[in-house]
């Protein structure tokens, strides 16, 4: 069957959002993707979702990200504007109204969204062929 | 393929105006940034303007400000510099570039030659 | 403004050199600091932005080190493509500024 719409948003946001790091894509997340063997596809996609969305309420106004230049101010600001259009497309992809994250292990934002884009491809690969 | 295209370089009298043209494709041109770098002959680089194209607002240079104008089309995908009292120390390469999405400017373009003479 | 200093403006090299190129800012700009390679005839390629990341592409014979005022871009192992002159730049607030290059060629 054709490759989601969708699918192919979040991987181009994805690719964007990993071509560069920032001080502030070094930061922490929940790691979803430690022990995600009984997790189906769509909670997958719901959990990253619910990661990103903590990520961005928390440091939306985070000074340590925020800068103290306008210049840096555009570049979280660009930041926050690509996790909340990954947020809102894997939201779409996954179709869950909630999903718990629980766990304990963390990781950087940065390796978390490498680790998203290497699922998404795996996704895509297969929806293609 | 990300690509930017330059044009509308050329030959003016000093006191003229000339507007360049810079086509972008292969990406979302409204989810980076764009510059304008000069380089005069034989010398180095310097920064003229940015623009934020989800907003439209430029950030000019001093020595800019007032002369020199950066808009947008963003159903061409395409960004302008309206250069106007053109000064014989305005001759140069005009590169138009791309922000990275964090940091630096990530493609360029080929470069188009004003040159302001009598 | 910020001024960007490069020194030194040029230097002659062999290959297989190492060589080390400095940049000092007028005043602190954290790490928001990137180097570009230009070729003759050329548009300026990004290698380094935040002082020490290299750009998609870029071999690992490039590194960018420093903070605050000093930075530093090193060629571990000089290649005959790499005959260049190489900028830094600020990005750290507006204007954005470029240093003065540095040319490097062939001794």
């Known amino acids: 069957h054709k490759c989601d719409i969708t699918l192919q948003e979040i991987i181009k946001t994805l690719n964007s959002l990993t071509e560069q790091k920032t001080l502030c894509t070094e930061l922490t997340v929940t790691d979803i993707f430690a022990a995600s063997k009984n997790t189906t596809e769509k909670e997958t996609f719901c959990r990253a979702a619910t990661v990103l969305r903590q990520f961005y309420s928390h440091h939306e106004k985070d000074t340590r990200c925020l800068g103290a230049t306008a210049q840096q101010f555009h570049r979280h600001k660009q930041l926050i504007r690509f996790l909340k259009r990954l947020d809102r497309n894997l939201w779409g992809l996954a179709g869950l109204n909630s999903c718990p994250v629980k766990e304990a292990n963390q990781s950087t934002l940065e390796n978390f969204l490498e680790r998203l884009k290497t699922i998404m491809r795996e996704k895509y690969s297969k929806c293609s062929s | 393929e990300v690509q930017l295209v330059e044009s509308g370089g050329g030959l003016v009298q000093p006191g003229g105006s000339l507007r360049l043209s810079c086509a972008a494709s292969?990406?979302?041109?409204?989810?980076?940034?764009m510059h304008w770098v000069r380089q005069a002959p034989g010398k180095g680089l310097e920064w003229v303007v940015w623009?934020?194209?989800?907003?439209?607002?430029?950030t000019y240079a001093d020595d800019f400000k007032g002369r020199f104008t950066f808009s947008l089309d963003n159903s061409k995908n395409t960004a302008y510099l309206q250069m106007n009292s053109l000064r014989a120390e305005d001759t140069a390469v005009y590169y138009c570039?791309?922000?990275?999405?964090?940091?630096?400017?990530?493609?360029w373009g080929q470069g188009t030659l004003v040159t302001v003479s009598s | 403004d910020i001024q960007m200093t490069q020194s030194p403006s040029s230097l002659s090299a062999s290959v297989g050199d190492r060589v080390t190129i400095t940049c000092k800012a007028s005043?602190?700009?954290?790490?928001?600091a990137a180097w570009y390679q230009q070729k003759p005839g050329k548009a300026p390629k990004l290698l380094i932005y935040?002082?020490?990341h290299r750009y998609t592409g870029v071999p690992s014979r490039f590194s960018g080190s420093g903070s605050g005022t000093d930075f530093t871009l090193t060629i571990s192992s000089l290649q005959p493509e790499d005959f260049a002159t190489y900028y830094c730049?600020?990005?750290?607030?507006?204007?954005?500024?470029f240093g003065q290059g540095t040319k490097v060629e062939i001794k």
């Open positions: 005043q602190s700009v954290i790490n928001d």
């Open positions: 570039a791309r922000g990275g999405i964090f940091y630096g400017m990530d493609y």
């Open positions: 935040y002082t020490s």
């Open positions: 730049q600020q990005d750290y607030t507006s204007p954005w500024t």
């Open positions: 292969g990406y979302t041109f409204t989810d980076y940034s």
């Open positions: 623009i934020n194209t989800e907003t439209g607002e430029p």
